[in-house]
């Protein structure tokens, strides 16, 4: 179920266990706001369970770094694939234009 922010902080407890990067589906960081004047970190696990993480924990800070690195790598891979597709399309277009010229 999605995080519900009803004009207050979302996290009333935090996870005391270790969360592995492999089990993460999503990691949301909420900046301080008028409705909640503290940082909140909510992890969504691959099994759909949502859990709040302690922003002050060294393990959590390390997890965030790894997660952000993973996300940026995935973005690069996506962009790379898009770039490759564009190249293929350009090649196909140039081939077509050559074919047109030769006919």
């Amino acid at each position: 179920t999605p995080v519900v922010r009803k004009g207050r902080c979302s996290c009333i407890s935090t996870n005391q266990g270790t969360i592995h990067l492999q089990s993460l589906k999503d990691l949301k960081q909420f900046a301080p706001s008028p409705s909640c004047e503290k940082i909140e970190i909510i992890a969504t696990l691959k099994n759909g369970v949502q859990t709040c993480l302690n922003p002050d924990s060294a393990d959590v800070k390390e997890l965030i770094k790894k997660w952000e690195k993973q996300v940026s790598q995935k973005k690069k891979q996506k962009n790379g694939k898009k770039h490759q597709k564009k190249k293929v399309l350009k090649v196909r277009k140039s081939q077509r234009s050559r074919q047109k010229k030769t006919t």
Epitope: T1, V3, V4, K6, R8, C9, S10, C11, I12, S13, T14, N15, Q16, K38, I42, Q50, T51, C52, N54
Partner: antibody, heavy 122, light 108 residues
Framework: QVQLVESGGGVVQPGRSLRLSCAAS????????MHWVRQAPGKGLEWVAL????????YYADSVKGRFTISRDNSKNTLYLQMNSLRAEDTAVYYC???????????????WGQGILVTVSS | EIVLTQSPATLSLSPGERATLSCRAS??????LAWYQQKPGQAPRLLIY???NRATGIPARFSGSGSGTDFTLTISSLEPEDFAVYYC??????????FGQGTKLEIK
């Protein structure tokens, strides 16, 4: 194993004050939200107050707002309920309970103390 | 404030029978509902959370169902130790967390 032990109950006159304590062990208290729930003699359960893991926000039932204060000392693994301006209708068994979920929606009150009786009578 | 109405107030059954307890909310609570069992002189015990998830150590004969405004706690085959008072609790719109008035399950 998880243990929650309430103390500080007793008989008190209307208008007076009382402080309940709840000593926690067997889990990471500093990561857990805690509640007070009460039960008047022969009646059902009534939620009283909630304090998140860090004590940042506190939430109260309308019936106790402005009179009761929930607090915690994470270094002592202890939860408190300061009860001021006590009324006859505050007479109940008071339970401390641990929040099993993270956001207050998911989960439930997964561990409870044995309860402590507070009697407000002149 | 969301009001929870439990029915019946008292349910008289024999061991081995199936028990069906109902909890109705005055407005939708999605699936944010918990069930508790309380025996005389004891603290309540969490049975079901998020409408249908059994809490740790709760026997499989206990099951929860429903969403929105109508919820059911079912005990498939009653054991002698199941006779107690059962409360539902909404966790959707808090504060306050509200409890139903309870259903007393007694031996017939």
């Amino acid at each position: 194993q998880v243990q929650l032990v309430e103390s500080g109950g007793g008989v008190v006159q209307p208008g007076r004050s009382l402080r309940l304590s709840c000593a926690a062990s067997g889990f990471t208290f500093s990561n857990s939200a805690m509640h007070w729930v009460r039960q008047a003699p022969g009646k059902g359960l009534e939620w009283v107050a909630l304090i998140p893991f860090d004590g940042y926000n506190k939430y109260y039932a309308d019936s106790v707002k402005g009179r009761f204060t929930i607090s915690r000392d994470n270094s002592k693994n202890t939860l408190y309920l300061q009860m001021n301006s006590l009324r006859a209708e505050d007479t109940a068994v008071y339970y401390c309970a641990r929040e099993g979920g993270y956001t207050g929606y998911d989960g439930g009150f997964d561990y409870w103390g044995q309860g402590i009786l507070v009697t407000v009578s002149s | 404030e969301i009001v929870l109405t439990q029915s019946p107030a008292t349910l008289s059954l024999s061991p081995g029978e199936r028990a069906t307890l109902s909890c109705r909310a005055s407005q939708s609570v999605s699936s944010y509902l918990a069930w508790y069992q309380q025996k005389p002189g004891q603290a309540p015990r969490l049975l079901i959370y998020d409408a249908s998830n059994r809490a740790t150590g709760i026997p499989a004969r206990f099951s929860g169902s429903g969403s929105g405004t109508d919820f059911t706690l079912t005990i498939s085959s009653l054991e002698p130790e199941d006779f107690a008072v059962y409360y539902c609790q909404q966790r959707s719109n808090w504060p306050p967390y509200t409890f139903g008035q309870g259903t007393k399950l007694e031996i017939k």
